[in-house]
Interface confidence: medium
Amino acid sequence: GWVWNQFFVPEEMNTTSHHIGQLRSDLDNGNNSFQYKLLGAGAGSTFIIDERTGDIYAIQKLDREERSLYILRAQVIDIATGRAVEPESEFVIKVSDINDNEPKF
């Protein structure tokens, strides 16, 4: 099955690549025989995946007021056979608040 924790990315991140976390199949024994793919809005532009490890990075600054969560899909393929190792799965990346609209008194 798929293994991951909940994903958060800080809005207005101050680096050009923020490591969000890792998606992986529990069948992956680390010998680079699987390929991870990211699909959905923001895949390949706002978010990228390391095809070998399943590590996900944000490479664009995000504004929580514009969009507070992204729903993406993950695939993992056996390179030797080209077949899916796990069913395609949906997951969420939440944009965490940095209180840029604090209440005014």
């Epitope: 050009t16 690549s17 490591h19 680079n32 990228i48 095809e51 070998r52 490890t53 590590d55 990075y57």
Partner: antibody, heavy 120, light 111 residues
Framework: QVQLVQSGAEVKKPGASVKVSCKAS????????MSWVRQAPGQGLEWMGI????????TYAQKFQGRVTMTRDTSTSTVYMELSSLRSEDTAVYYC?????????????WGQGTLVTVSS | QSVLTQPPSASGTPGQRVTISCSGS????????VNWYQQLPGTAPKLLIY???QRPSGVPDRFSGSKSGTSASLAISGLQSEDEADYYC???????????FGGGTKLTVLG
């Protein structure tokens, strides 16, 4: 803040080996690839290879295959680049640079550089 | 010879707009994101533009990047004396399975 601090300048004889270190701080060491890029005097930048500090996986540029070895020590957040069978053309400044995952990730932070001089 | 072709030099006067080109092929610029680095004399390179047209924080909006087909370009508007540096394009090459850099362009700010 992210910092990459490299070892000091080296002078080597032709045929010898050199090992340059790059100590990372200010981020999760195992979450980002590290590349090595060199620059000969008055010349452009040349990518040598990459290491993933988490698993230690490496990819080397064809030109350096068989002569370069990249390793890492996760306990000290340090990556190493060893170049063997040195020749005068290997005289260059060697940089470590964070990033370089296939297709997308850029080199966002660079070490200060290590000058390696190969001379008899 | 570099896989990516850049003009060896470029120049302009303060306030002018200068463009530096980077020409590649389908296996590099045609398929992947382009990054640009600035190297001031005697210092390490610094990321200037990433994923074709994104600026890291701290890089003035005078710098912009674009990509079309197998070519990319870096534009610098409102040229300033501190922009005098070497500029390199870089991209992953699928055929070589590695990163390639352009030969670099030395930018001179005249007057």
């Amino acid at each position: 803040q992210v910092q990459l601090v490299q070892s000091g300048a080296e002078v080597k004889k032709p045929g010898a080996s050199v090992k340059v270190s790059c100590k990372a701080s200010g981020y999760t060491f195992t979450s980002y690839y590290m590349s090595w890029v060199r620059q000969a005097p008055g010349q452009g930048l040349e990518w040598m290879g990459i290491i993933h500090p988490s698993g230690g996986d490496t990819t080397y540029a064809q030109k350096f295959q068989g002569r370069v070895t990249m390793t890492r020590d996760t306990s000290t957040s340090t990556v190493y680049m060893e170049l063997s069978s040195l020749r005068s053309e290997d005289t260059a400044v060697y940089y470590c640079a964070r990033g370089g995952i296939k297709l997308w990730l850029h080199f966002d932070y660079w070490g200060q550089g290590t000058l390696v001089t190969v001379s008899s | 010879q570099s896989v990516l072709t850049q003009p060896p030099s470029a120049s302009g006067t303060p306030g002018q707009r200068v463009t530096i080109s980077c020409s590649g092929s389908r296996s590099n610029i045609g398929s992947n994101f382009v990054n640009w680095y600035q190297q001031l004399p005697g210092t390490a390179p610094k990321l200037l533009i990433y994923t074709n047209n994104q600026r890291p924080s701290g890089v003035p909006d005078r710098f912009s990047g674009s990509k079309s087909g197998t070519s990319a370009s870096l534009a610098i508007s409102g040229l300033q004396s501190e922009d005098e540096a070497d500029y390199y394009c870089a991209v992953w090459d699928d055929s070589l399975n590695g990163w390639v850099f352009g030969g670099g362009t030395k930018l001179t700010v005249l007057g």
